[in-house]
């Protein structure tokens, strides 16, 4: 069964995932897609990084943490009903049969009539639950389990960053980005540098 | 028009090795994972091995990942299976096939070779 | 494994006919379902992907649908290019399997 995520209509989801780099700067491809993991790849993708940088993207989707150090945590920006559903988030690490898969279910609740908004409901409002039992079932499916150990000193780094989300959401087209500009696009919706 | 055209196939004793490969064109190779699939005669299909784009990851049916490997060869459009410690159970229709791409979505194999027919036999 | 159990593993049909061909996985494989036709002596051809997204060039007399565990091909009206065997096969879980197929005879 997957980890379920929820967040509001209009608001950030926040959808974790992370590994662990086997060392600054060797990084492994990710991809995350809509729907539950495939036995390859990420069903229909909507983002994924290279062994350098963010090389595809699609509107309303990005990175808030730092990829190159392993948190590949997908934000879906203004979230309507339509992106209720199950998300794959894919390691790609090389080798035979290696692949880290996860399937995180996200639930859209409908957006309640409040004043105005804090800054914190930018993302769901708590910090996602993580689980480290690790799971392998017949079909290769794993949710969160098989997430690297992360300490207290990365939760409360990850904390400030889902605190400090609408300064991570003003900061990530600046000179900071992960998003990058691409060689060219398919459409306003689609962002990609070609993955040779 | 995309075209898979398989070669290499033959007959070989038990315990010999082949190698057999599959030239890929009209669709950018670099952009697909790829895979091949046997069909032994009169019986049904069966998955062999995948591989990814640059061939990074690989991935193999667990009683067969001992003996054979999949590889290729994104300059020369072409996919290959090398075949060792051979088998009469292993006597088969090979297939290349093409599978998903770069943007995932189409889960199926679109694409199919010919096929290259490997008789194990002494 | 996912195993993948089609039914009937035969069948005979007449030209017009509406035929129907099931598959069952022994897992939850949502919709990471494909169908293939193959006739003898050639290389099979994709039908169906996705469990109901039409494969390019296929006639619009084939449909598949189902999610999960249960799934369907169906033919609305039989055509004589249609007699050959049927598979289905997941790309859901790893090893990827296909259905033992179903051989559809004329009749």
């Known amino acids: 069964s997957e980890v379920e995520y929820r967040a509001e209509v209009g608001q950030n989801a926040y959808l974790p995932c992370f590994y662990t780099p086997a060392a600054p700067g060797n990084l492994v491809p990710v991809c995350w897609g809509k729907g539950a993991c495939p036995v390859f790849e990420c069903g229909n993708v909507v983002l994924r990084t290279d062994e350098r940088d963010v090389n595809y993207w699609t509107s309303r989707y990005w990175l808030n943490g730092d990829f190159r150090k392993g948190d590949v945590s997908l934000t879906i920006e203004n979230v309507t009903l339509a992106d209720s559903g199950i998300y794959c988030c894919r390691i790609q690490i090389p080798g035979i049969m290696n692949d880290e898969k996860f399937n995180l279910k996200l639930v859209i609740k409908p957006a309640k009539v409040t004043p105005a908004p804090t800054r914190q409901r930018d993302f769901t409002a708590a910090f996602p639950r993580m689980l480290t039992t690790r799971g392998h079932g017949p079909a290769e499916t794993q949710t969160l389990g098989s997430l690297p150990d992360i300490n207290l000193t990365q939760i409360s780094t990850l904390a400030n960053e889902l605190r400090d989300s609408r300064l991570a959401n003003d900061l990530r087209d600046s000179g900071a980005t992960i998003r990058g500009s691409s060689d060219y696009k398919d459409d306003d919706d689609k962002h990609h540098h070609h993955h040779h | 028009e995309v075209q898979l055209v398989e070669s290499g196939g033959g007959l070989v004793q038990p315990g010999g090795s082949l190698r057999l490969s599959c030239a890929a064109s009209?669709?950018?190779?670099?952009?697909?994972?790829m895979a091949w699939v046997r069909q032994a005669p009169g019986k049904g299909l069966e998955w062999v091995a995948n591989?990814?784009?640059?061939?990074?990851?690989?991935y193999y049916l667990d009683s067969l990942k001992s003996r054979f490997t999949i590889s290729r060869d994104n300059a020369k459009n072409s996919l290959y299976l090398q075949m060792n410690s051979l088998r009469a159970e292993d006597t088969a229709v090979y297939y290349c096939?093409?599978?998903?791409?770069?943007?995932?979505?189409?889960?199926?194999?679109?694409?199919w070779g010919q096929g290259t027919l490997v008789t194990v036999s002494s | 494994d996912i195993q993948m159990t089609q039914s009937p593993s035969s069948l005979s049909a007449s030209v017009g006919d509406r035929v129907t061909i099931t598959c069952r996985a022994s897992d939850n494989i949502y919709s990471y379902l494909a169908w293939y036709q193959q006739k003898p002596g050639k290389a099979p051809k994709l039908l169906i992907y996705n469990a109901k997204t039409l494969a390019e060039g296929v006639p619009s007399r084939f449909s598949g649908s189902g999610s999960g565990t249960d799934f369907t091909l169906t033919i609305s009206s039989l055509q004589p290019e249609d007699f050959a065997t049927y598979y289905c096969q997941q790309h859901y879980g790893s090893p990827l399997t296909f259905g033992q197929g179903t051989k559809l005879e004329i009749k």
């Open positions: 096939a093409r599978d998903v791409g770069y943007y995932g979505g189409n889960y199926g194999f679109a694409y």
């Open positions: 009209g669709f950018t190779f670099s952009d697909y994972y």
């Open positions: 591989i990814n784009y640059d061939g990074s990851s690989t």
